[in-house]
């Protein structure tokens, strides 16, 4: 069987194809090469002479049980190497000869037993190494890190290593690799030597499930003493053993580690004092918790000095009461319980993110709402029913406005955005908007980007409520139910690019109201039930369009519409998936496509 | 169709086929099996995926004696530091996992419960398996 | 078994030619495809061109693209690599090779070329 060509000449899959030896039919140029779940068992020495171009090869679960020396030997372009669940038993010195340019290699589950035998030593180029799901014993890193000065990324997680000493880490001494990552989760640590990560740098240290209780992890965080971390991550996993007990005790050796981003991920555990739990985290510049259930919402509004706090997937008994002076982005995402709104004081936030909490809102939006004049970037999408009640007063710096899926009352009502003259980007998509008042976007001057699909229009009517959006590049007017449109609508976005008016329910086109739309690219009818023109003469869009798309409508293929049908085949250069265009009536021609239709029209004598 | 026999309970008796045409071997046990009335119990999976289960989330499509309830979908991996450990399982690797599930008070009418699980990972989105569930409901009370 | 034998190299000043010259023998019909690599002095082997017997497809590295062309004569089982406007980065021993239905590589004995003024 052959393997499908996904790119030609570039890209093919021959996943599982029962192959016993490399295939030797693809072309020379093959860049991407998955091979996976095939029984090659052994790869000899330049098993892939035929591949000069190779970039990416992924030999997951191919029975490989012996690698020999130089089998990847002239694959000087191969960046990736993926080997995960082979079996391997025998690996020679040179297994991994020639592989100048690999930037990440793959060992997930390959029985690989110590890092010291591993030959990779003279992998330069390597960006991330994950030996994850081995059984690998001991945390030292051998001499040969020194070699791997680019190396980004180590996941040693799922391994059996229980100590860390001082002597582990003494190559990451001789060489700082300022920007490595490293994944220890899922290793069942009893004991880490005092000093073992004094003066080290990590760009990040994730310790997840490492600890069968509270003492350990007590112990084992002392010991992390002298580390200067960017970012640490500790927690557990839903589905592995959790810790019976926590306490403030478990984090007290965090002060004596230098962290600047701190995350808690999901802990099997009520948190109800805060402010002691993570006292030794008041001063990281940002603090997150996923997946954590909360009781006491109070303690949000203590000082602490955190720049940007993120809470996601979490359960609060009520909207957390939040206070603190010097924060400037907050991520409150996808929780349960406090299903209303309360106001927040936080005079620094420039960034809001409250989408997916099922939110009330009973008035939005002004600066006491939050607390801020700072703010540029607000998103409320998907959350319940929010109440128009000002127009932004105090929040004039917004540039970002994201309210969709989530219920609109009183937008139609006055000019909700008025004040909003630095707003770059607005949804309102599935909001519930009607609109029935000519002003809805009045004072978006600065415009550019408006997402407006599914709602509805008075009458399905479009009139011309877009007169000041004279920098928009982008609309979307899609599924609003529209049957007409004001012959002016368009008149003042001579910038627009894109204008979406697919899924709704126009029985005609023309081309009279996109006359002003001079940088207009792309025009997309797609989903309507356009028929015929409005006019019998259709005149040229702007020249400017490069895209349009007409497809699933319900065109009639008559002799009464021969003129639109011919116009239609003289945009041929402009249309989109043109075999999608079928003609809906009369129904000897239903399921025809449009353009190869040859109407010769005829007087009936 | 070959049905995969999961489990007998005190009111539920529980199946499953294939609905995708790989049909890639996954065991599922649940112990003990579940009660609709009230359950408590283990979830064990045993599976190797034929892609990264990074972004994993289910489309769930459920019918009660014949009658069609709205798809859900369930996110189950977000993609960084998520809840559960398999969520970082590559393409190839052993996923052999254990999770824990508990519900009570629901009442469920007698008859047969239909709930094709639409597996979805990756970048860019492929379907991972499809497993059709039957679960026959005798409740001895109701 | 297949046995390569090179033939061709030498000494050669910039700007200059050489033909390079590969016969094979013994197993010859279950040669897939063939090909010319190439190892500088404290370098790793590299390809320099690739010919497959089946269709005819041909490949060449970036570095020697436009200057070096292989072709074969199938009368005389053999692989040839012209090689015109030569550099002196082109200095190396020249191997030849062949790849069989078996994935088993031959190699020959290599035959070295310098390009120098």
């Known amino acids: 069987e052959p393997c499908v060509e996904v790119v030609p000449n570039i890209t093919y899959q021959c996943m599982e194809l029962n192959f016993y030896k490399i295939p030797d039919n693809l072309p020379f140029s093959t860049k991407n090469l998955d091979l996976s779940f095939n029984p090659l068992r052994h790869l000899g020495s330049y098993s892939f002479f035929s591949f000069p171009e190779l970039q990416v090869l992924d030999l997951s679960r191919c029975e490989i049980q012996t690698i020999e020396d130089g089998a990847y030997q002239s694959l000087s372009h191969l960046s990736t190497l993926i080997l995960t669940g082979n079996p391997i038993q025998s690996l020679a010195l040179g297994a991994f000869s020639g592989l100048s340019s690999l930037q990440k290699l793959v060992a997930v589950e390959t029985n690989l037993a110590s890092l010291e035998n591993f030959p990779i030593g003279h992998l330069k180029t390597l960006k991330e190494l994950n030996v994850a799901h081995n059984l690998i014993q001991s945390f030292k890193l051998p001499e040969y890190f020194s070699n791997l000065t680019n190396l980004e990324h180590l996941d040693l997680s799922s391994n059996k290593i229980q100590s860390i000493y001082c002597t582990d880490l003494r190559v990451l001494h001789q060489m700082p690799l300022l920007n490595l990552s490293l994944d220890l989760s899922l290793n069942p640590m009893n004991f880490i030597q005092p000093g073992a990560f004094k003066e080290i740098r990590l760009h990040k240290l994730t310790l997840r499930n490492n600890f069968d209780s509270l003492n350990v992890m007590k112990t084992c965080i002392q010991g992390l003493a002298g580390l200067e971390v960017h970012r640490l991550v500790l927690g557990e996993f839903r589905n592995e053993g959790n810790l019976e007990k926590f306490d403030k005790s478990a984090l007290e050796g965090l002060c004596n580690l230098t962290i600047e981003e701190f995350r808690l991920a999901y802990l099997d555990y009520y948190l109800d004092d805060i402010i002691d739990l993570f006292n030794c985290l008041t001063n990281v510049s940002s603090f997150s918790l996923v997946s954590v259930t909360i009781e006491r919402v109070k303690d949000f509004s203590y000082n602490f000095g955190w720049q940007h706090l993120e809470l996601v997937n979490c359960k609060f008994g009520q909207f957390p009461t939040l206070k603190l002076k010097s924060l400037k982005r907050l991520t409150f995402t996808s929780n349960k319980g406090g299903n209303a709104f309360s106001e927040v004081d936080l005079p620094s936030l420039e960034f809001l993110d409250l989408s997916r909490n099922g939110l009330s809102f009973k008035g939005c939006c002004s600066q006491s709402d939050f607390g801020t004049t700072s703010l540029k970037y607000l998103d409320l999408s998907f959350n319940g029913v929010i109440t128009m009640s000002s127009n932004f007063l105090g929040l004039e710096q917004l540039e970002h406005l994201d309210f969709q899926h989530s219920n609109l009352k009183q937008m139609s009502e006055f000019s909700v955005f008025l004040s909003l003259r630095n707003l770059i980007y607005l949804d309102i998509s599935h909001t519930h908007t009607r609109v029935a008042f000519n002003g809805i976007f009045n004072g978006l001057s600065s415009l550019e980007v408006l997402k407006m699909a599914g709602n509805s229009f008075q009458e399905n009517f479009l009139p011309d409520i877009f007169t000041e959006l004279r920098n928009l590049t982008f609309l979307d007017l899609s599924q609003c139910q529209l049957e007409q449109l004001s012959p002016t609508a368009f008149n003042s976005l001579s910038s627009l690019q894109v204008l979406n008016m697919s899924h709704n329910n126009f029985f005609s086109l023309d081309t009279f109201p996109y006359k002003c739309l001079n940088s207009l690219q792309v025009l997309d009818y797609s989903l309507n039930h356009i028929m015929t023109s409005k006019k019998q003469e259709l005149q040229h869009f702007p020249s400017s369009l490069a895209f349009l798309n007409l497809t699933q409508n319900d065109f009639a293929c008559t002799c009464e519409h021969q003129s639109f049908l011919q116009w239609i085949k003289d945009q041929r250069q402009l249309l989109v998936e043109v075999e999608r265009m079928e003609c809906a009536t009369p129904s000897d021609k239903q399921g025809m496509p449009v353009l190869s239709l040859n109407i010769t029209c005829q007087m009936n004598k | 169709q070959k049905q995969y026999w999961v489990c007998n309970s005190s009111d539920a008796s529980i199946s499953y086929t294939y609905c995708d045409k790989m049909q890639y071997p996954i065991s599922i046990n649940v112990n003990p099996c579940i009660e609709l009335k009230r359950s408590k119990g283990l979830l064990h999976i045993f599976y190797i995926p034929r892609r990264d289960l990074k972004q994993l989330y289910f489309n769930l499509y459920i019918t009660v004696n014949t009658m069609n309830l709205p798809k859900r979908k369930e996110v189950i991996c977000r993609g960084s530091d998520d809840d559960y450990s398999f969520c970082r399982a590559l393409k190839g690797e052993t996923v052999n996992t254990t999770i824990s599930f508990s519900f009570k008070g629901i009442k469920f009418s007698k008859g047969k419960y239909k709930c094709v699980v639409e597996a979805i990972s990756g970048s860019p989105e492929e379907m991972l398996f499809c497993l059709e569930f039957v679960i026959l409901h005798q409740p001895n009370s109701n | 078994e297949v046995q390569l034998v090179e033939s061709g190299g030498g000494l050669v000043q910039p700007g200059g030619s050489l033909r390079l010259s590969c016969a094979a023998s013994?197993?010859?019909?279950?040669?897939?495809?063939m090909g010319w690599f190439r190892q500088a002095p404290g370098k790793e082997r590299e390809h320099a061109a690739l010919?497959?017997?089946?269709?005819?497809?041909?490949y060449y590295a970036d570095s020697v693209k436009g200057r070096f062309t292989i072709s074969r004569d199938n009368a005389k089982n053999t692989v040839y690599l012209q090689m015109n406007s030569l550099k002196p980065e082109d200095t190396a021993v020249y191997y030849c090779?062949?790849?069989?239905?078996?994935?088993?590589?031959?190699w020959g004995q290599g035959t070295q070329v310098t390009v120098s003024s």
């Open positions: 090779a062949a790849k069989t239905g078996t994935s088993f590589v031959y």
């Open positions: 010919i497959r017997f089946k269709d005819g497809s041909i």
């Open positions: 013994g197993s010859i019909f279950s040669i897939n495809d």
